[in-house]
């Protein structure tokens, strides 16, 4: 291995193979206590009034001031090693017999006590003068999170003693804390990419790579911002972070050039009525820029000449639009185009769509109402309204008749077939007024009702009637 590696492997082991602290005879065997029971004490020794680490009467403050100072022995201050290596270190202290009250040694890291699953052992080396305590700490396969300042704490005669810190520096390959992000950019427009990696060891230097080629001949100190003056085609960028342990490569990010969207596809008619068509589509590829709005283009398919194109603008989402104010029973060609910040897509393929037939636009004409007293019926006649082709095929009429007399109100309606232009309805109430209106019906729906015609139904006496309010040209209002 290299010299740095060798230092790690040998120097650390000397922490344990070297001479023990203090004045211990070689033949003394230590008592050991694992970390989980760090307050465990060695067995009392014969011939001592107050064996070390056992509770004793409180020493007076004056007496405690007379005791010699006690402190942790100096140890290695800085350990540098590579990730995944094992590390061991220790702190040690010599406690004279004059100290009557001590607690176990605890390990701390960066100001927090290390509890639980840390591998530490406390060894006790008693002799006639006192006891030496060595607290051993080991970490298997160190990680970056093990970096930090470790120290020991102990209470002796109610006074807290803290060791010098042992700084553990775990070195490894650079670690990215900020990697370049994919962005979509306008052609020939400058943009920035950022890359930041850390050690230890520092420094960390950055090389930028574009489409497998290093961009910079000289490394830049991390963090690095790459300003790309502009691209004309998609590129893949990554950054390489170097330190003295090796190099790490960031994820490769695609930098896409914004272009106009692709045309929408799958234009479908979801529903048609006489005057509207509900159209849907699937947006095309957005060209690396969000779609902003869409345009529905509509032209009459039946026109021999190049009919004008109607344009309806809508938001890009949902991918749905109801085209309104169309003619009934007409054929239309429909296409969709969408835009992003760069521009409009080409139009989708044109599709054919038809509106359904409409309802009649005019009411029946020349309505007359006559009371046939002998049969106790109303005789109603009218003329067929002028129905256009787009109004659809006449299928019949609806007659609305409303009967009103003192205290009685009755609203009725009948549907009659298109054969003929007359109908008979039975008298419902005598001594009443009857109001009649008629509407034409096609497959497209019901048309407007005619103006009302009133007739007074006497109590079995003479009849007054009024003709339709929409007579045919040349007709009079009387009969």
């Amino acid at each position: 291995g290299g010299t740095a590696e060798k230092w790690e492997e040998t120097e650390l082991d000397q922490l344990f193979s070297g001479p023990l602290p203090g004045r211990l005879p070689v033949n003394h065997r230590p008592f050991s206590a694992p970390h989980s029971s760090r307050d465990q004490l060695p067995p009392p020794q014969t011939g001592r009034s107050h064996p070390a680490h056992t509770a004793a009467p409180q020493v007076t403050s004056t007496a405690s001031k007379l005791l010699p100072p006690v402190a942790f022995n100096h140890t290695i201050g800085h350990i540098v090693l590579s990730e995944h290596k094992n590390v061991k270190f220790n702190c040690s202290i010599n406690i004279p017999n004059t100290y009557q009250e001590t607690a176990g040694i605890s390990w701390w890291k960066d100001g927090k006590e290390l509890l639980g699953a840390h591998h530490s052992i406390t060894q006790f080396y008693p002799d006639e003068e006192g006891v030496s305590i060595i607290a051993l700490f080991s970490i298997a396969s160190v990680q970056r999170s093990d970096n930090g300042s470790y120290f020991c704490k102990m209470k002796v005669n109610n006074r807290e003693i803290v060791s010098d810190p042992i700084y553990v520096e775990v070195q490894g390959l650079p670690y990215f804390i900020k990697q370049p992000e994919s962005v979509n950019v306008t052609r020939n427009t400058a943009f920035n990419l950022t890359c930041q990696a850390v050690g230890p060891p520092e420094p960390v230097n950055i090389f930028w790579v574009q489409n497998s080629s290093r961009v910079n001949e000289k490394p830049e100190r991390s963090p690095s911002v790459l300003t790309v003056p502009g691209l004309t085609e998609t590129a893949v960028f990554s950054c390489e972070a170097h330190n003295d342990k090796g190099l790490t490569v960031s994820k490769g990010v695609h930098i896409n050039i914004k272009v106009i969207p692709s045309p929408p596809t799958e234009v479908h008619i979801l529903n048609s009525t006489a005057h509207s068509i509900l159209v849907s589509w699937v947006p095309g590829f957005d060209g690396y820029s969000p779609l902003q709005n869409c345009s529905i283009q509509v032209k009459e398919a039946d026109r021999l000449s190049n009919g004008s194109v109607m344009v309806f603008n809508t938001s890009a989402s949902p991918h749905l639009y109801e085209i309104q104010q169309l003619q009934a029973l007409a054929n239309y060609s429909i296409a969709v185009s969408c835009r992003n910040e760069i521009g409009w897509s080409a139009v989708s393929p044109w599709i054919l769509a038809s509106t359904t037939e409409g309802a009649p636009s005019v009411a029946p004409l020349n309505i007359t109402v006559f009371l046939n007293e002998s049969n106790n019926i109303l005789d109603i006649r009218w003329t067929k309204p002028p129905i256009k082709r787009q109004d659809g095929e006449l299928v019949g009429y609806r007659i609305s008749h409303v009967w009103e007399s003192a205290g009685t109100y009755k609203e009725l309606s009948e549907e009659v077939s298109q054969n003929g232009s007359w109908a008979q309805i039975p008298v419902q109430i005598h001594n009443a007024t009857c109001t009649v209106r008629i509407a034409a019906i096609t497959k497209g729906g019901i048309g407007p009702f005619s103006e009302p015609v009133n007739i007074i139904i006497p109590e079995h006496s003479k009849v007054d009637y009024a003709p339709s309010s929409t007579p045919a040209p040349g007709n009079t209002d009387s009969m």
Epitope: P201, N205, P219, N243
Partner: antibody, heavy 114, light 109 residues
């Protein structure tokens, strides 16, 4: 532009030591680890060692006992010292950027002869 | 110490694609070997082509590309040109030292 330039004694007597300087321009040695490589006449390349940006070193294990690499960052110079030269140390010696062996000096020829 | 093996010589024609390989005696070549490819031309002119993470050095034409193929590192020259005639060395990093291959003499006829 990053450039490396080696300078050496040319001729060294057997058992003597060799000192070569690599002068770096266009970049700081605090950002660039430098490797040393040699090529004996008519043979391939042999890596000698590296000096890291932090000043640490690693060496070819077969030559480690005879090699010392150091640097003076303020002068932007890297030094190769090799002891106990023998005739088979005759070669052209190069310094090169480390992680990418893409920037090379032109080399300096060292002949070990009495 | 690891031994790095290359083809001793290869011949190609202008416009053809040629692949040079680099094998390690210790097993498969991995990204942590940081395979480098160095070109030597007459008069001791060395140029690094591919390094680190298989990225081309600045100014190196795109026809040179590095990759890992199977258990070997590879240098591919797509559309070789007469000026590509040279000796090509691969170097692999093993934790704390580089090991060079013996070099491949590429002839472009």
């Amino acid at each position: 532009q990053v450039q490396l330039k080696e300078s050496g004694p040319g001729l060294v007597a057997p058992s003597q030591s060799l000192s070569i300087t690599c002068t770096v321009s266009g970049i700081s040695l605090s950002s660039f680890a430098i490797s040393w490589v040699r090529q004996p006449p008519g043979k391939g390349l042999e890596w000698l060692g590296v000096i890291w940006t932090g000043g640490g070193t690693d060496y070819n294990s077969a030559l480690k006992s005879r090699l010392t690499i150091s640097k003076d960052t303020s002068k932007n110079q890297v030094f190769l010292k090799m002891n106990s030269l023998q005739t088979d140390d005759t070669a052209r010696y190069y310094c090169a950027s480390h992680w990418y062996l893409d920037v090379w000096g032109t080399g300096t020829t060292v002949t070990v002869s009495s | 110490q690891a031994v790095v093996t290359q083809e001793s010589a290869l011949t190609t024609s202008p416009g053809e694609t040629v692949t040079l390989t680099c094998r390690s005696s210790t097993g498969a070549v991995s990204t942590s070997n940081y395979a480098n490819w160095v070109q030597e031309k007459p008069d001791h002119l060395f140029t690094g082509l591919i390094g680190g993470a298989n990225s081309r050095a600045p100014g190196i034409p795109a026809r040179f590309s590095g990759s890992l193929i199977g258990d070997k590192a590879a240098l591919t020259i797509t559309g070789a040109q007469t000026e590509d005639e040279a000796i090509y060395f691969c170097a692999l990093w093993f934790s704390n030292h580089w090991v060079f291959g013996g070099g491949t003499k590429l002839t472009v006829l």
